[in-house]
């Protein structure tokens, strides 16, 4: 049994880091493998992650971490029984994938304005809370070409757009994702999408 693709990990910079790797053949990850991880810190204890299958030869493990900060560095040991298959390290702050924003809501009761709001996925005491920026994707269910991205570079988790920038009388969907420049993160996953019917009063032709 050998590791074909070494583990690569990303952290949500809060409580979970996800590591993925591939074996050289079909593997029952949860029964055959264990990923041991330990913070390089005074008094830290080793923890064991039981991986799940991610395709025939792929494995994924969700590492639980407390109080993630920039200084943290973890040792990783991948075991198959008594055999050490791979040894490495992981610094969560250098591989951050933020949590996806939630609770995306489209408020259509403001006159001729669409207000989209969503929730910051981090608590106020997490460093990323004040450092997320967002991308909002709006698309038409009827017209695949009607697809647009709005970059939200301010901290407030909301976006205002004129309803007239979208076509009237058809349904749209929106979703939002986040990233943080300070840690050069990847983009988060998209939030679940939300749907609304866009309608507004056309201005009278002269």
């Amino acid at each position: 049994m050998k590791v074909l693709q070494e583990p690569t990990c990303v952290s949500d910079y809060m409580s979970i880091s996800t590591c993925e790797w591939k074996m050289n053949g079909p593997t029952n990850c949860s029964t055959e493998l264990r990923l041991l991880y330990q913070l390089v810190f005074l008094l830290s204890e080793a923890h064991t992650c039981i991986p799940e299958n991610n395709g025939g030869a792929g494995c994924v493990c969700h590492l639980l971490m407390d109080d993630v900060v920039s200084a943290d560095n973890y040792t990783l040991d991948l075991w198959a029984g008594q055999q050490l298959l791979w040894k490495g390290s992981f610094k969560p702050s250098e591989h951050v994938k933020p949590r996806a924003p939630g609770n995306l809501t489209v408020h259509t009761n403001v006159s001729d304005t669409l207000l989209l709001t969503w929730s910051n996925p981090y608590p106020p005491d997490n460093y990323l809370y004040n450092h997320l920026t967002y991308a909002v994707n709006i698309w038409s269910e009827n017209d695949p070409a009607d697809f647009r991205i709005y970059n939200v570079t301010y901290l407030e988790p909301s976006l205002r757009i004129a309803a007239s920038t979208l076509k009237s009388g058809i349904s749209y969907r929106a979703r939002v994702r986040a990233w943080a420049q300070c840690y050069n993160t990847t983009w988060s996953e998209w939030s679940p999408s939300t749907k609304w019917h866009n309608s507004y009063r056309e201005p009278f032709e002269q």
């Epitope: 005074l42 008094l43 204890e45």
Partner: antibody, heavy 116, light 111 residues
Framework: QVQLVQSGAEVKKPGASVKVSCKAS????????MHWARQAPGQGLEWMGI????????SYAQKFQGRVTMTRDTSTSTVYMELSSLRSEDTAVYYC?????????WGKGTLVTVSS | QSVLTQPPSVSAAPGQKVTISCSGG????????VSWYQQLPGTAPKLLIY???KRPSGIPDRFSGSKSGTSATLAITGLQTGDEADYYC????????????FGTGTKLTVL
């Protein structure tokens, strides 16, 4: 919100021991390390040691090895610092502080006076 | 006695900028992260800066930290009378006796 509530002031005779408590609330007690530091009157901060509330393991500053004992009670989310063989130089305010590489939250401090 | 050296005192007028230095070595600041603590008279220390230059929520952006080599600096702009306090730097000893260190402390007086 996070609170670290320390026990009240103590007056001790030289050679005696003192046990200071620090009750934590507002967070997952076993998820954060707890440090102890002290500050003699008019002096700076001095680190004493650290305890991992999860397993109870400890590490102490060399200066206090053999004289200090840090323990925890997970049922009450309380950590304790006991200092033995007290001398007058141990007169100080003793602080518990939550954190790992840096200390996020501090207790208000417990004044321990050692006097004959 | 601390191996992190700070000036015993600094002073400046309200509205001015002041900097406090913290000098260490390769086995501490040079190889670790720096934090700063503010201790107002008669109170417990409070975390002001961590991870060299990050502020906890609630700390105004008048306070900033930086690190270069084996030294670190705390800068306070727009000085206010309420900033009068003792300031301590902190880091880790990364040699064999791995443990936290505090600086000698600096008394800031707002004139």
């Amino acid at each position: 919100q996070v609170q670290l509530v320390q026990s009240g002031a103590e007056v001790k005779k030289p050679g005696a021991s003192v046990k200071v408590s620090c009750k934590a609330s507002g967070y997952a007690f076993t998820s954060y390390y707890m440090h102890w530091a002290r500050q003699a009157p008019g002096q700076g901060l001095e680190w004493m040691g650290i305890i991992n509330p999860s397993g109870g393991s400890t590490s102490y500053a060399q200066k206090f090895q053999g004289r200090v004992t840090m323990t925890r009670d997970t049922s009450t989310s309380t950590v304790y610092m006991e200092l033995s063989s007290l001398r007058s130089e141990d007169t100080a305010v003793y602080y518990c502080a939550r954190g790992k590489w840096w200390l996020y939250n501090w207790g208000k401090g417990t004044l321990v006076t050692v006097s004959s | 006695q601390s191996v992190l050296t700070q000036p015993p005192s600094v002073s400046a007028a309200p509205g001015q900028k002041v900097t406090i230095s913290c000098s260490g070595g390769s086995s501490n600041i040079g190889n670790s992260y720096v934090s700063w603590y503010q201790q107002l008279p008669g109170t417990a220390p409070k975390l002001l800066i961590y991870d060299n230059n990050k502020r906890p929520s609630g700390i105004p952006d008048r306070f900033s930290g930086s690190k270069s080599g084996t030294s670190a600096t705390l800068a306070i702009t727009g000085l206010q009378t309420g900033d009068e306090a003792d300031y301590y730097c902190g880091t880790w000893d990364t040699s064999t006796h791995r443990h936290p260190l505090f600086g000698t402390g600096t008394k800031l007086t707002v004139l």
